[in-house]
């Protein structure tokens, strides 16, 4: 938890941020909260980024003030204007780019004082894997596919029956660059699978971890998948 303290000559206010990750091409949120003020016109929010010329976003006197906004954020940022009065200074970032990664500062001025807190924002690509039985293969085979990952992840197979088993010898993983030349499609094939077993395809990079499960029995196939962002911590 990062708590910001004020500048001399004025009281300090508490500002809290949460480290987070953005999925490139999608919208992201940079979280920041502060001790609220009773008057919206007294609140100034400034978002800054290390190494950037100008501001990421500025909100003052109840509206956006973008005359000093950096070009790389133009048309891509917004605060939740109706929630500023209750202490929400979070920033919505549209169409997240790899280059948006870095250290951000949420800087707040209210009638009570000033405060700021830093936030580490990671960017990459992550997506839910889908595991299917590959009926085209000569032997019982599973195919795990996830459309968008960056940086290149690791892929590990596991099974409920053979817990702790190493499937690297009986699996093959490939990474195919997508058309935008950054993210990659992940395809992993597991050979010699047995019936009445649950297999998991786990994809992980330094931003996210995703798992696709498949349970294969003689009568049915059940699938489940989930995704978890890594290293999201409060500041």
């Amino acid at each position: 938890l990062i708590i910001g303290f004020g500048i001399s000559g004025r009281h300090s206010i508490t500002v809290t941020t949460v480290a987070s990750a953005g999925n490139i091409g999608e919208d992201g949120i940079l979280s920041c909260t502060f001790e609220p003020d009773i008057k919206l016109s007294d609140i100034v929010i400034q978002w800054l980024k290390e190494g950037v010329l100008g501001l990421v976003h500025e909100f003052k006197e109840g509206k956006d003030e973008l005359s000093e906004q950096d070009e790389m954020f133009r048309g891509r940022t917004a605060v939740f204007a109706d929630q500023v009065i209750v202490g929400n200074a979070s920033l919505r970032l549209k169409n997240v780019q790899l280059t948006d990664a870095g250290t951000y500062k949420c800087y707040i001025i209210t009638s009570k004082g000033k405060g700021n807190a830093n936030l580490e924002y990671k960017t990459g690509a992550f997506s839910m894997p889908e595991v299917n039985v590959d009926y085209n293969a000569s032997s019982e085979t599973l195919r795990c596919e996830a459309p968008r990952w960056f940086p290149q992840p690791t892929v590990v197979w596991a099974s409920q029956v053979d817990q702790g088993a190493n499937f690297s010898e009986v699996s093959n993983t490939s990474f195919e660059l997508n058309s935008e030349n950054v993210t990659m499609k992940v395809v992993s094939v597991l050979y010699n699978v047995t019936i009445n077993n649950t297999y998991s395809c786990m994809i992980e990079n330094d931003i996210a971890k995703a798992t696709g499960d498949i349970k294969v029995t003689e009568s049915e196939i059940k699938r489940r998948s989930h995704l978890q962002l890594l290293n999201s911590k409060a500041s």
């Epitope: 190494g51 010329l53 000093e68 906004q69 790899l98 960017t123």
Partner: antibody
Framework: EVQLVESGGDLVKPGGSLKLSCAAS????????MSWVRQTPDKRLEWVAA????????YYPDSVKGRFTISRDTATNTLYLQMSTLKSEDTAMYYC????????????WGQGTLVTVSA | DILMTQSPSSMSVSLGDTVSITCHAS??????IGWLQRKPGKSFKGLIY???NLEDGVPSRFSGSGSGADYSLTISSLESEDFADYYC?????????FGGGTKLEIK
């Protein structure tokens, strides 16, 4: 069409001062961050100064900090570089550059103006 | 400061060839890299920004790739107008720093 035209380059003695100008046209001047970049006689490029869209934020490398000042005049669409306490290592071709709309740096360049610092 | 090491410093190539120029940053720069071109007798112009994106009006035979600290500019099917000087530049932190340049010459 984006046009950047530098002027003010000259031969000056070490310790002297000089003010470079860059006349900008073909775009909304107040909407773009601007920079000065120099190319030394050995062809190396060195970023010298940058100024934000509204002019409130300026940055310099340590090599010129305290000696060079970047400024802009929105009324006349002009970028300036005030150089003082000039040294022989400041000898270079100085270019005015404009950022791209998407946040790229050094998308557009002028033709340059030559500054020679010599006794 | 981030040091940008560009290679090669010069190369002789033929029309129609495909060439790659590389830049290594002294630390990861998260795609905050641009590539510039300077044709003989002309000024500089931006070619690529954010590692992979073409600036307006740049032909599609130019492409950028890379991640972390290593990036490259590739020109496929070289045309006569592509013989020029090329520079990389990082803009992840101040000061902005440039590579030493690559001179592309006709063989």
């Amino acid at each position: 069409e984006v046009q950047l035209v530098e002027s003010g380059g000259d031969l000056v003695k070490p310790g002297g001062s000089l003010k470079l100008s860059c006349a900008a046209s073909g775009f909304t001047f107040s909407s773009y961050g601007m920079s000065w970049v120099r190319q030394t006689p050995d062809k190396r490029l060195e970023w010298v100064a940058a100024i934000s869209t509204g002019g409130s934020y300026t940055y310099y490398p340590d090599s010129v900090k305290g000696r060079f000042t970047i400024s802009r005049d929105t009324a006349t669409n002009t970028l300036y570089l005030q150089m003082s306490t000039l040294k022989s290592e400041d000898t270079a071709m100085y270019y005015c550059t404009r950022r791209g709309a998407t946040g790229s740096w050094f998308a557009y360049w002028g033709q340059g103006t030559l500054v020679t610092v010599s006794a | 400061d981030i040091l940008m090491t560009q290679s090669p410093s010069s190369m002789s190539v033929s029309l129609g060839d495909t060439v790659s120029i590389t830049c290594h940053a002294s630390q990861g720069i998260n795609n905050n890299i641009g590539w510039l071109q300077r044709k003989p007798g002309k000024s500089f112009k931006g070619l690529i920004y954010h590692g992979t994106n073409l600036e307006d009006g740049v032909p599609s035979r130019f492409s950028g790739s890379g991640s972390g600290a290593d990036y490259s500019l590739t020109i496929s099917s070289l045309e006569s107008e592509d013989f020029a000087d090329y520079y990389c530049v990082q803009y992840v932190q101040f000061p902005r720093t440039f590579g030493g340049g690559t001179k592309l010459e006709i063989k």
